[in-house]
């Protein structure tokens, strides 16, 4: 299939011009080589008309030219001085010869239709109304008042003053007249369609001093927004239909031969191919909203209406507003996987991509929610701290540079199961979705933490050790401290007498960590993990209290606070002795269906921005060390 | 040279339907655009629909939503499905081929064919 995409239909009248886009993927190559534009014709060839290398047939002579614009991968064709013999097959394409990457193009033009001189022209979109001015002389204000559509053969009644109506106009069609004015009337038409386009005429009075005025009325379908989106992105509808329709229910439907089938709507119809990839958002009270998809798929192309009508779905003469998608299987966002499975206890490493240009953007993970309109919660953001229901068991790592961020979530339940979202306060395309599945656990975790019910004494020397089994010999172990803005991982150097160590017991094959002497600040979660280079492994989760010596009652430790974790991450963490101060943006986020809410969340977080200090608030930093005695079973 | 033969006009009454089909033979593989003209009583010729090598269809306000134009997988069978037929579609119904030469505009015109609604 040819990632060039452009206008399927132009269509202008004689003496007009017309502005043709054409859009092309991302590439230098793209964005240097001949751009045309070529008419086809007998025979399957396709004759030159003009291109990017300068040249232009004589045809087109003083009435074209052709633009490209790399830095939006498009180009655009200007024609001028529209004849009847324009129409006809067109391709805009690249390449050095026509038989290159192409887009068909039907330009169709019009004879510009031969109306009496005195016609006044009213145009307007379908679903929208008209009022028509109907001037008269005053002899004639007592007399009938009508307005009739022309037929061939007649003029078919439309509105009377003495209230006539046709029955296709019931409910439609007004006649009055405004305040003392006695020398025009006007009549109002409203949820015009295709059907309503034609002559009309106004008349006051009767016999050959009755006044008339010849209307044009052309009704007209709204011109398709071209979207060109990459594969695996997302894009946003933005929907304007105006203030006479805030109050009704809205929808978005794609076309499908003749019907156009609603995708969602706003009284909580959403087919099922957009579970877990859609929102829509009321913008305002002006009847704007918004649709956003993410994780777009090749099926997904296509064209798109969105209208608003009180059953929340088509209408005939209601507004609508219409875009033709294109989806670029040329995509510059990585193929990941879209489904994850994990198992109860266990965890799930999710790597989300994001636009390597943008490293510094803010990253965020929220869950998408089915319910009312369906929404987004941010669930955890590099600078948003982790909602207090994912404490110790959910972390952002971000490694600037290389286009991926991964996010841990561990202690798995059946109720984590769901769609995830992967966004970011940068390029809205790189939206990502994600299904988590999560089956219940069949076998022993690879990790496993002694003590599980870890009280450590204040003061005194505690260590929990960390099992893994010989598979994992050749990986590097770690533990981090988990903070609801990440999980620290401890250096690998000692730095001074008040340390943790990590040490490698060939024989048993495991990892401890010895905090001596133990500290208040001590207490909370930990994670124990393998990974190789950047990529992580599985990790498990263990929450550890701190008692003083004389208090002898045990602490108890948060509801499943030490089930166990399995991860595969991708990133190593960034520190994260951030500033305690509280995130007001995060508690109750919103949907994220467009940039300004991210960038709020986004803005109001440089508060919480990183310090870079990796030690401990007391000043005192902790260390551990890791050794790895290769040991083959 | 293109040769194009039309077929299905007649009688209808007002609000039934009729099928117009046109053949194209000859230089067929050219055509650019097929479609539907028509000239009824007292009017000059007027454009009906037509459809173009991409399969956009394009149609005249006055009969958008009644009339429906297909063709076949060759391209050299055009179909006018007529509904809601009126009084005011009576007419001869010509169908038009039209071919680029690489530097020209050619119509190609068939015979017409008689289209009468009744009332």
């Known amino acids: 299939k040819s990632p060039i995409f452009g206008p399927q239909e132009v269509s202008s009248i004689e003496g007009d011009s017309v502005s043709i886009t054409c859009y092309y993927p991302d590439t230098s190559v793209n964005r240097h080589t001949r751009k045309y534009w070529c008419r086809q014709g007998a025979s399957g060839m396709c004759t030159t008309l003009i291109s990017s290398n300068g040249y232009l047939s004589k045809e087109y002579s003083g009435r074209a030219n052709l633009i490209n614009f790399p830095e939006n991968n498009t180009f655009v064709i200007n024609i001028e001085q529209l004849t009847q013999d324009d129409t006809g097959s067109y391709k805009c394409g690249l390449g050095t010869s026509n038989r290159g990457l192409s887009f068909d193009v039907s330009l169709e033009v019009s004879q510009v239709p031969e109306l009496p001189s005195d016609t006044h022209v009213y145009t307007k979109d379908i679903g929208r109304n008209v009022t028509i001015e109907c001037p008269f002389k005053r002899e004639n204000a007592p007399s009938k008042k009508s307005l009739c559509k022309k037929t061939n053969q007649s003029c078919e009644l439309v509105i009377d003053s003495t209230e006539k109506v046709n029955p296709s106009y019931i409910g439609r069609a007004k006649l009055f007249m405004k305040g003392t004015d006695l020398t025009v009337f006007y009549v109002n038409i409203s949820h015009l369609t295709h059907n309503d386009a034609g002559l009309y005429i106004c008349q006051a009075g009767e016999g050959p001093s009755a006044d008339k005025k010849n209307v044009d009325l052309q009704v007209l379908a709204p011109e398709p927004e071209l979207l060109y989106k990459d594969l695996r992105s997302s894009v946003t509808f933005e929907c304007d239909l105006g203030r006479e329709v805030a109050n009704e229910a809205k929808y978005l439907c794609r076309m499908n031969k003749e019907t156009c089938d609603v995708i969602i709507n706003t009284l909580g119809k959403r087919d099922p191919d957009f579970e877990g990839r859609i929102l829509i958002t009321p913008k305002d009270d002006n009847g704007r909203f918004s649709v956003l998809i993410t994780g777009l798929r090749k099926e997904d192309a296509g064209h798109y209406q969105c209208g608003a009508h009180s059953s929340g779905l088509p209408q005939e003469g209601w507004p609508i507003q219409t875009w033709q998608l294109f989806v670029n299987e040329e995509s510059t966002i990585p193929n990941r996987r879209s489904v994850v499975k994990g198992v109860t206890g266990g965890s799930v490493a999710i790597a989300c991509p994001y636009n390597p240009k943008e490293s510094s953007s803010l990253k965020y993970w929220c869950r998408w929610e089915g319910d009312g309109n369906g929404h987004c919660p941010v669930l955890v953001g590099t600078q948003a701290q982790v909602q207090e229901e994912y404490e110790g068991r959910l972390a952002l790592f971000d490694q600037p540079g290389n286009g991926t961020y991964t996010v841990i979530l561990n202690q798995l339940t059946t109720e984590d199961a769901g769609f995830y979202w992967c966004l970011t306060n940068g390029d809205s395309r790189w939206r990502t979705t994600i299904e988590l599945q999560v089956a219940e656990a069949t076998r022993e975790p690879n990790l496993e933490v002694t003590p599980q019910n870890a009280t450590a004494v204040l003061g005194e020397t505690f260590t929990v050790s960390c099992h893994y089994p010989c598979k994992f010999y050749s990986q590097e172990k770690y533990w981090c401290k988990w903070s609801n803005k990440g999980c620290h991982i401890l250096p690998s150097h000692d730095e001074g007498a008040r340390q943790s160590s990590v040490s490698c017991d060939q024989s048993s094959q495991l990892v401890s960590m010895t905090l001596n002497p133990v500290s208040k600040e001590d207490e909370g979660w930990y994670w124990c993990g393998v990974k190789q280079g950047q990529t992580y492994g599985e990790t498990t989760a263990i929450y550890i209290a701190v008692e003083e010596r004389t208090r002898g009652s045990s602490h108890v430790n948060p509801t499943d606070a030490n089930a166990r974790a399995k991860v595969a991450l991708e990133e190593e963490v960034v520190d994260s002795s951030i500033s305690e101060k509280e995130n007001k943006a995060i508690p109750n986020p919103g949907p994220f269906a467009n940039e300004r809410e991210i960038q709020n969340v986004g803005d109001q977080a440089q508060e919480n921005r990183a310090s870079g200090d990796a030690g401990s608030a007391d000043g005192q930093s902790r260390s551990s060390s890791s050794k790895h005695h290769h040991h083959h079973h | 040279q293109v040769q194009l033969v039309e077929s299905g006009g007649g009688l209808a009454q007002a609000g039934g339907s009729l099928t117009l089909s046109c053949a194209a033979s000859?230089?067929?593989?050219?055509?650019?655009?097929m479609g539907w003209y028509r000239q009824t009583p007292g009017n000059s010729r007027e454009f009906v629909a037509r459809?173009?090598?991409?399969?956009?269809?394009h149609y005249a306000d006055s009969v958008t939503g009644r009339f429906t134009l297909s063709r076949t997988q060759d391209k050299n069978t055009v179909s006018l499905q007529m509904n809601s037929l009126k009084p005011d579609d009576t007419g001869v119904y010509y169908c038009?081929?039209?071919?680029?030469?690489?530097?020209?505009?050619?119509?190609?015109w068939g015979q017409g064919t008689q289209v009468t609604v009744s009332s």
């Open positions: 459809i173009f090598s991409n399969d956009v269809t």
């Open positions: 000859g230089t067929a593989a050219g055509i650019d655009v």
């Open positions: 038009n081929a039209r071919i680029w030469t690489g530097s020209t505009t050619v119509d190609y």
